[in-house]
């Protein structure tokens, strides 16, 4: 039902990589424009977006509020230009999101590889810990922070002179491997959240391999 | 439920090949990682080797690097181990394992094997 | 590639005894290594992960600890369904490798 020129928005679904959360809808707008609303389970609704011509609404700063809690969104569609018109009941037409639970759903960003360095026989990698738009204490907080022992980093590493790929992981954002001498390697990491059934892996880093500029090398 | 089912086992002749297939259910394969796990008659469990299909990248163990490859197809929810240039000691039983990609990297789900007997 | 020496290759055990199982890693593994259950024509299950984690549905007579490079496998109490064969596993570098497993029979 509804006004006879308002369509109900459709196709709710959320777009989150390390807590940057962007809920899109369908359709294009022909003649109409949408409010976004969003609650916790037990909260109170509060509005986003008011009568936006756009199909989408970035709710990061509500989500981040609490990011283990489970949100729902809702999007109210309205005839442009007469935004008080409402459905037949009385109501201006929505429609409900999927529920989205942050901690465990968010897709994890592609890693950095921040650093090498090697050292004899041994070679030490770091990667960049991701700034989230998460706080605590008006600090914005690292994905380690957010996640804690929750997150762990596997490292692939090969020598530049073959294809096999070895693996490593680490619960910190550091890695210490045993290297041959004199052959050069090459490195990608990718973020795990092993306790989740979905969205588990982050796309793989960039490669990064030693001679180039990143890495250092210390002969001792 | 989450599953695997290993299949394609049998007999082959000195120098054959053969296809296992290890097909999962219950979860998407490029989520895990998949490692194949072989056991001889009356034998200790030999790791094969693995692949992470999310990117393809593998990694095998000495006895049977360059005669096997993994591989896997995520439109099938499908790894494969292809074995050739066959050995009378490459007969036992072969199992894929799911691999959590924890900090210990255990093997939490195994399929229930497939024989395969090499033997003129 | 690091070795997992497990002792003894075989035991034998009455129901109700406590029984030990060890591995030794070569070189230090950390925490990541986990062991296996296996029964004539079956699959290995798992046990314990990261040394000594009960993974679930494990009855809780077994445990798993860990010395430095030495880990230890633990059934406190022997059941009729636990004569089996278990086997350690490291992880901690790539190739993963097993012990030789230990036959668990019966006495």
């Known amino acids: 039902s509804g006004t006879t020129n308002t369509v109900a928005a459709y196709n709710l679904t959320w777009k989150s990589t390390n807590f940057k959360t962007i809920l899109e809808w369908e359709p294009k707008p022909v003649n109409q424009v949408y409010t976004v609303q969003i609650s916790t389970k037990s909260g109170d609704w509060k509005s986003k977006c008011f009568y936006t011509t756009d199909t989408e609404c970035d709710l990061t700063d509500e989500i981040v509020k609490d990011v283990k809690q489970t949100y729902l969104a809702r999007v109210f569609s309205y005839p442009a230009g007469n935004v008080e018109s409402t459905g037949s009941a009385g109501e201006p037409l929505y429609e409900n999101s999927p529920e989205f639970t942050p901690y465990l759903e968010t897709n994890l960003g592609q890693p950095t590889i921040q650093s090498f360095e090697q050292v004899g026989t041994k070679v030490n990698v770091t990667v960049e810990d991701e700034r989230t738009l998460v706080r605590r204490n008006n600090t914005f907080l690292s994905l380690r922070d957010v996640f804690g022992k929750d997150l762990i980093y596997t490292l692939y590493y090969w020598k530049s002179s073959s294809s096999g790929k070895k693996t490593a992981k680490t619960n910190t954002n550091e890695f210490l491997i045993d290297v041959d001498k004199g052959e050069n390697y090459c490195f990608s990491v990718q973020a795990v959240i092993p306790s989740r059934t979905v969205n588990r892996k982050s796309t793989d880093s960039p490669v990064e391999c030693m001679g180039q500029e990143k890495g250092e090398f210390r002969e001792i | 439920e989450v599953q695997l089912v290993e299949s394609g086992g049998g007999l082959v002749q000195p120098g054959g090949s053969l296809r296992l297939s290890c097909a999962a259910s219950g979860f998407t394969i490029p989520d895990y990682i998949i490692h194949w796990v072989r056991q001889a008659p009356g034998k200790g469990l030999e790791w094969v080797g693995y692949?992470?299909?999310?990117?393809?990248?593998?990694y095998y163990a000495d006895s049977v690097k360059g005669r096997f490859t993994i591989s896997a197809d995520t439109s099938k929810n499908t790894a494969y181990l292809q074995m050739n240039s066959l050995r009378a000691e490459d007969t036992a039983v072969y199992y894929c394992a799911r691999d959590i990609q924890s900090v210990s990297g255990e093997f939490d789900y195994w399929g229930q094997g497939t024989l395969v007997t090499v033997s003129s | 590639d690091i070795q997992m020496t497990q002792s003894p290759s075989s035991l034998s055990a009455s129901v109700g005894d406590r029984v030990t199982i060890t591995c030794r890693a070569s070189q230090d593994v950390n925490t990541a290594v986990a062991w296996y259950q296996q029964k004539p024509g079956k699959a290995p299950k798992l046990l314990i992960y990261?040394?000594?984690f009960l993974y679930s549905g494990v009855p809780s007579r077994f445990s798993g600890s860990r010395s430095g490079t030495d880990f230890t496998l633990t059934i406190s109490s022997l059941q009729p369904e636990d004569f089996a064969t278990y086997y350690c596993?490291?992880?901690?570098?790539?190739?993963?490798?097993f012990g030789q497993g230990t036959k668990v029979e019966i006495k």
């Open positions: 990261s040394a000594s």
């Open positions: 692949i992470d299909p999310s990117n393809g990248y593998t």
């Open positions: 596993q490291q992880h901690y570098t790539t190739p993963p490798t």
